[in-house]
Amino acid sequence: DAHKSEVAHRFKDLGEENFKALVLIAFAQYLQQCPFEDHVKLVNEVTEFAKTCVADESAENCDKSLHTLFGDKLCTVATLRETYGEMADCCAKQEPERNECFLQHKDDNPNLPRLVRPEVDVMCTAFHDNEETFLKKYLYEIARRHPYFYAPELLFFAKRYKAAFTECCQAADKAACLLPKLDELRDEGKASSAKQRLKCASLQKFGERAFKAWAVARLSQRFPKAEFAEVSKLVTDLTKVHTECCHGDLLECADDRADLAKYICENQDSISSKLKECCEKPLLEKSHCIAEVENDEMPADLPSLAADFVESKDVCKNYAEAKDVFLGMFLYEYARRHPDYSVVLLLRLAKTYETTLEKCCAAADPHECYAKVFDEFKPLVEEPQNLIKQNCELFEQLGEYKFQNALLVRYTKKVPQVSTPTLVEVSRNLGKVGSKCCKHPEAKRMPCAEDYLSVVLNQLCVLHEKTPVSDRVTKCCTESLVNRRPCFSALEVDETYVPKEFNAETFTFHADICTLSEKERQIKKQTALVELVKHKPKATKEQLKAVMDDFAAFVEKCCKADDKETCFAEEGKKLVAASQAALGL
């Protein structure tokens, strides 16, 4: 339905508060280095303009597309060339090329200072002094650091952020009330950002069909009682929402997401019995709740899949005449029966089924050729099952920190060219799979673990894409979305790698390590571990363990010393020498 003024349409649909918040998010995700005040000024100008269009849709420029309006506004930033360099060239382009150009310049790892959390009293004062600015600043800081954060979901986070301050700044012990809530929001926010980044990568690198296949599998697991036609409709709508958000069309995305939540709640009887509570909540909570809702119970007495997908005489005809529908139905039927499988495994099975039909249907006896296709699934199912079993055993044996270290060593040996901060970040996140998923019963382990690993490996892929250094990473990241994890799992030690020159400076530590939080201290130690492996990729587990134990003892000793700095200097030299000897450097 065409509207005379798109900006007026979205302003009316979303309301002023959400409109302003979403425009701020959009601008901060595009111009990640711009100061907060500059963005607020731009947002206010766009909002005033939108109001004129609401008053008169025929007013000048009100008929322009949102990309044109927003792009024109971004291109008025005076410091564009000196701050962003070649991104300024985008402004010489016409829409839609200009927006595509802005999208290509989004930076997954912007050079921004770490967000330091002020004292609770300072935060509460700032919150009370100007609540609106305080919350806008939250949106701005998150959006610029996470340029693909799912915008309507960020509104939900901001609502919870506000609620935390509203409640806790009145509490007797403000810190005890507020800090756990902020920690939870931070951790959930990072997870949400990473999950959305995978959705955008799926759409942008592998196309709409890849995303739709993922959505069919996931929604079929979640809504196994829904008919295929219903799931297909939800998939189409969900794909539109995520395509818009990943494309920077945040107003349309938020509007369409609200419409989708409304539709789901109006039709919950034919979708899922688990939606009742979600649908009683306000909009932002409702949408979040639907996105996280537990899987509905599987219908009783589902027939065998073989009848329609192996035994039927029409298998090849149905496949050839409408692959998308037939393979979509296969994926739907398989997924609704297997909430115990990861989405990526289901997609591998569907791909194997498709490949088999493509190979067999033109053969003299197609049925004989594909009759055993389900037998081909067995090794595909067993591979992640075995991997998860082994790694959960290792996790239970080592605990999270040492499990992360095992993964750090494993991945540094596989892809030693990758930067140390990226290896540390990715391996730490890979290691979190243990505490996140190994506690689950068998039936929930695989969907938890393998789909989480897909999200984490995508972080590696997007960070590596910015500055590619390893052909092996590029290959695993680009060849197949669903086979990324098996591809990385299959990598052995990179025998072509020339070990890094030893640099004592890398292993020189100072007293400041003593004041760090436990997490930051772990990161320091893990950074040293990666560097050790880069210097000595052939080092054994035992050698690395001995060096790391010595290192931990050294830090502990010097942090207890009276003259910490002298201890770090003198004992540090001894440690470096001992480590070199132990590793034969």
């Epitope: 196309g207 090849c316 050839a320 005449e321 692959k323 493509e358 190979k359 067999c360 033109a362 197609p366």
Partner: antibody, heavy 119, light 110 residues
């Protein structure tokens, strides 16, 4: 040597019918899918349809109804009815690469036979 | 409707030149079902590349296919005298009935 050899082309009046043949030698036809593709003078290639080894046929949307593909042990046929001037073209038969059923990968082609529809 | 657009429709080049031909499909092809053919006057087409980037056996490595989804490219890295011909892309879709070819790019001697 594997060969595909078309025959049966010629001049036909508008509204008339024609049956083209594609004789296959050097391979066992019962294991392969064969396509018909045409090319009007100086124009694009146009896929007409396919017959799988099992005898199942599929046609381009525009070709359904007027064109029929069939086969016997060594020959594939293209029956063309209600011919029009715009059907004037060189008609080729071509084998689909083994291991594919619906992909446009044709590794062996005949030399083509010209069909002219004119009064 | 399926639309497969090849560009340019013709290109003049010299021996040793690098030649790039593009093929745009709407909608996207199914599962990288994209082929490239070479056709010389009075002859049948010859399959060069399948699955967007795989070289048919016997085809020289100067021919390279790339792309996915809707946008595909055939590159001849160093044009040889025998490469002057017309090149067609072919696409496969969700329905076999939609199998379509582009209208060709003629590579001529400059």
């Amino acid at each position: 040597e594997v060969q595909l050899l078309e025959s049966g082309g010629g001049l036909v009046q508008p509204g008339g019918s024609l049956r083209l043949s594609c004789a296959v030698s050097g391979i066992d036809l019962s294991n392969y899918a064969i396509n018909w593709v045409r090319q009007a003078p100086g124009k694009c290639l146009e896929w007409i349809g396919i017959i799988w080894a099992s005898g199942t046929t599929f046609y381009a949307t525009w070709a359904k109804g007027r064109f029929t593909i069939s086969r016997d042990s060594t020959t594939v046929y293209l029956q063309m009815n209600s011919l029009r001037a715009e059907d004037t073209a060189v008609y080729y038969c071509a084998r689909t690469v083994p291991g594919y059923s619906t992909a446009p990968y044709f590794d062996l082609w005949g030399q083509g036979t010209l069909v002219t529809v004119s009064s | 409707d399926i639309v497969m657009t090849q560009s340019p429709s013709s290109v003049s080049a010299s021996v040793g030149d690098r030649v790039t031909i593009t093929c745009q499909s709407s909608p996207s092809v199914w599962s990288n079902f994209l082929s490239w053919y070479q056709q010389k006057p009075g002859k049948a087409p010859k399959l060069l590349i399948y699955e967007a980037s795989k070289l048919t056996s016997g085809v020289p490595s100067r021919f390279k296919g790339s792309g996915s989804g809707t946008d595909f490219t055939l590159t001849i890295s160093s044009l040889q005298p025998e490469d002057f011909a017309t090149y067609y892309c072919g696409g496969g879709y969700s329905s076999i009935s939609d199998t379509t070819f582009g209208c060709g790019t003629k590579v001529e001697i400059k």
